[in-house]
């Protein structure tokens, strides 16, 4: 059994048929020693009596919310959750396998630019009854600080008859030196709880790996005279790490027909402007990617060639 | 040139010589991003490579302020994968394929510490630890790492010359 | 908890060969390096010989011809013989370990010792 | 082989005072490329096995009193303990690892004047 925060502890369960479970004592926080009975979250039935109270844990039905009383009086709580081990493995039933890159991808994180500052999110199909806390720090034996916000509902969406919910946070590395070639990772930590059940999921990463720059900016086309080309320039978003001249991009303009079977010609440059032939109907695609460092590419900015 | 008194390095060359040295480092090992390293432990072998830190003066302001520092830095960075990709954890068993990118790598790195450093002038002798043996079995791994680190560290001096070829070239 | 735990016979005579075993716990022998290390009577430490992650040796030269390191990954052990055994091979014998890297590195754990007397 | 020179050999001092030991080796141990310097400190105590106290010259191995602390560079190191108790009283060694073979330093003892 541990703390996770103040009154509540989390008691860790091997979890199998007839498993003994854990031994649990608790105290009443009061410097009062007689009277003192318990009772369980909203039951009136008397637990036990006296400044400790010895529990058996063994499954769902053993947790909750302890409250201590004197005559009518509550002294104190202490509110037990369950972390389930099956086969050795802590369980992971509140969050959703997001399958990108790797299986086992609970948490997924991306970064704008080098400033230290990034996103990381996660899906779930549970609704109510749930809390999520987060923490993050560059290393782990000798850590320095990441300061995350409170972890938010970003997005729902539906798939099939279930309903899908996105939560992100935002975490800022505190001393972050964005030109530093990193050599200890970011780890994340999130702890989940739904009802009385208890989950921490982690990911660990270097920034540089989660980089995806925001996708070109004022991508325009100018027409060249009596010709089918067109010149297409665009500018580095506003969201990317300056100066341009250290951290450069490099960018792939995609051609592209109505019809998705049509052939896709596609120019690699690290200039912020080219020369392509404009078909009609067609569109132009622009994308970035760090210059020097082959982490994500952007999403595509476009503009139709009419 | 960077030399030890203080002037210049061919900013230009070394530009475009680092920009090929991340193309090949990533052509060694392009799907280096599928394999969490974390998962295998020896978390050892990416601390005993060499990394541009932040007093390193490898950043803008730092470049502007007194370059030879980075500069420095790089080279003894440059001269230590050197020396790791011609270890017999490149050339032992298991066999790199005939047309493996890291025999151009290994020349690339050792061209651009010469770019960096002439004949006839020295920073300081520079010493790399004698390498613990590694068996076949080891060696996948190892050159793995080393050269998802060289990745990390060649980006880092790549954007160096772009931006000392953009503002510090005479 | 890591741990490393040695026996062997204390009490040799001239030309006997030593032998000594050490368990290991609460880590592998293909993670890490293990090592012999000697101290005479009242003397300083003295490198004898290591056997890699990859199950090769290497030994101290002046001991080379006379001393053989071998594992048993299985059981998690390690031993150290030394041949034709003199009253100068008389010392605390310790084994140790130390992490695997690309490069040698200190050792962090040792075993507790053992006395060997080399007497006729 | 790198010989590791360590002095004095014997250090006579009284608890709460300052003891600094010398260890130089006769070629360098810094890796440039990395910057770290092969070299540790360890105590020994009659009778028991030695203990590591700092390992890459300067970092100190956890459960090590912040009293000892480890400085140098190259071929030149240092190990302080910046206020003697009763317990430090005993020998110390420096170890290089930066080539094989590992190499020992012939010991400092400390002791109780």
């Known amino acids: 059994i541990w703390e996770l925060k103040k009154d509540v502890y989390v008691v860790e369960l091997d979890w199998y048929p007839d498993a003994p479970g854990e031994m649990v004592v608790l105290t009443c926080d009061t410097p009062e020693e007689d009277g003192i009975t318990w009772t369980l979250d909203q039951s009136s039935e008397v637990l036990g009596s006296g400044k400790t109270l010895t529990i058996q844990v063994k499954e769902f039905g053993d947790a909750g919310q302890y409250t201590c009383h004197k005559g009518g009086e509550v002294l104190s709580h202490s509110l037990l959750l369950l972390h389930k081990k099956e086969d050795g493995i802590w369980s992971t039933d509140i969050l959703k396998d997001q399958k990108e890159p790797k299986n086992k991808t609970f948490l997924r994180c991306e970064a704008k630019n080098y400033s230290g500052r990034f996103t990381c999110w996660w899906l779930t199909t549970i609704s109510t009854d749930l809390t999520f806390s987060v923490k993050s720090s560059r290393g782990s034996s000798d850590p320095q600080g990441v300061t995350c916000g409170a972890a938010t509902l970003s997005a729902e969406r539906v798939r099939g008859d279930n309903k899908e919910y996105e939560y992100s946070v935002e975490c800022q590395e505190d001393s972050a030196c964005p030109a530093a070639e990193e050599s200890l990772p970011i780890e994340v930590m999130v702890d989940a709880v739904h009802k009385l059940k208890y989950e921490n999921y982690t990911s660990s990463f270097f920034i540089r790996d989660i980089i995806k720059p925001d996708p070109p900016k004022n991508l325009q086309l100018k027409p060249l005279k009596n010709s089918r080309q067109v010149e297409v320039s665009w500018e580095y978003p506003d969201t990317w790490s300056t100066p341009h001249s250290y951290f450069s991009l490099t960018f792939c303009v995609q051609v592209q027909g109505k019809s998705k079977r049509e052939k896709k010609d596609r120019v690699f440059t690290d200039k912020t402007s080219a020369t392509v032939i404009c078909r009609k109907n067609a569109s132009i695609s622009v994308r970035a990617q760090d210059r020097y460092y082959s982490s994500s590419w952007s999403e595509w900015a476009s503009v139709p060639c009419s | 040139r960077a030399v030890p008194g203080g002037s210049s390095p061919a900013w230009t060359q070394c530009q475009q010589l680092s920009q090929k040295l991340c193309t090949l480092a990533w052509s060694a090992h392009p799907l280096v991003g599928h394999m969490d390293l974390r998962e295998e432990g020896d978390e050892e072998t990416t601390n005993d490579v060499p990394h541009i830190q932040c007093g390193d003066g490898c950043d803008p302001q730092g470049l502007r302020d007194n370059s030879q520092f980075c500069l420095q830095r790089i080279h003894q960075g440059l001269i230590f994968y050197e020396k790791l990709l011609g270890s017999d954890i490149f050339t032992g068993e298991p066999s790199l394929l005939p047309d493996s990118p890291v025999g151009q790598l290994h020349a690339s790195l050792l061209g651009l510490s010469q770019l960096l450093q002439p004949e006839g002038h020295h920073w300081e002798t520079q010493q790399i630890p004698s390498l613990s043996p590694s068996q076949p079995w080891q060696r996948l791994l190892l050159r793995f790492k080393i050269l998802r680190s060289l990745q990390a560290f060649v980006a880092v001096a790549a954007r160096v010359f772009a931006h000392g070829a953009a503002t510090l070239s005479p | 908890e890591v741990q490393l735990q040695q026996w062997g016979a204390g009490l040799l005579k001239p030309s006997e060969t030593l032998s000594l075993t050490c368990a290991v716990y609460g880590f592998s022998l293909i993670s890490y390096n293990v090592h012999w290390i000697r101290q005479p009577p009242g003397k300083g430490l003295e490198w004898i010989g290591v056997?890699?992650?990859?199950?090769?040796?290497d030994y101290n030269s002046v001991l080379k011809s006379r001393v053989t390191i071998s594992r048993d990954t299985s059981k998690n052990q390690f031993s150290l013989k030394l041949s034709s055994v003199t009253a100068a091979d008389t010392a605390v014998y310790y084994c140790?370990?130390?992490?695997?890297?690309?490069?040698?590195?200190?050792?962090?754990?040792w075993g507790q010792g053992t006395l060997v007397t080399v007497s006729s | 082989e790198i010989v590791l020179t360590q002095s004095p050999a014997t250090l006579s001092l009284s608890p709460g005072e300052r003891a600094t030991l010398s260890c130089k080796p006769s070629q360098s141990l810094l890796s440039s490329g990395n910057r770290k310097n092969y070299l540790a400190w360890y105590q020994q105590k009659p009778g028991q096995a030695p203990r590591l106290l700092i390992y890459?010259?300067?970092t100190r191995q956890s459960g090590i009193p912040d009293r000892f602390s480890g400085s140098g560079s190259g071929t030149d190191f240092t190990l302080t303990i910046s206020r003697l108790e009763p317990e430090d009283f005993a020998v110390y060694y420096c170890?290089?690892?930066?080539?094989?073979?590992?190499?020992f330093g012939g010991g400092t003892k400390v002791e109780i004047k």
């Open positions: 170890l290089q690892h930066f080539n094989y073979p590992w190499t």
């Open positions: 140790a370990r130390d992490k695997y890297g690309l490069f040698p590195g200190y050792f962090d754990y």
């Open positions: 056997i890699w992650t990859g199950g090769s040796t």
């Open positions: 890459y010259a300067s």
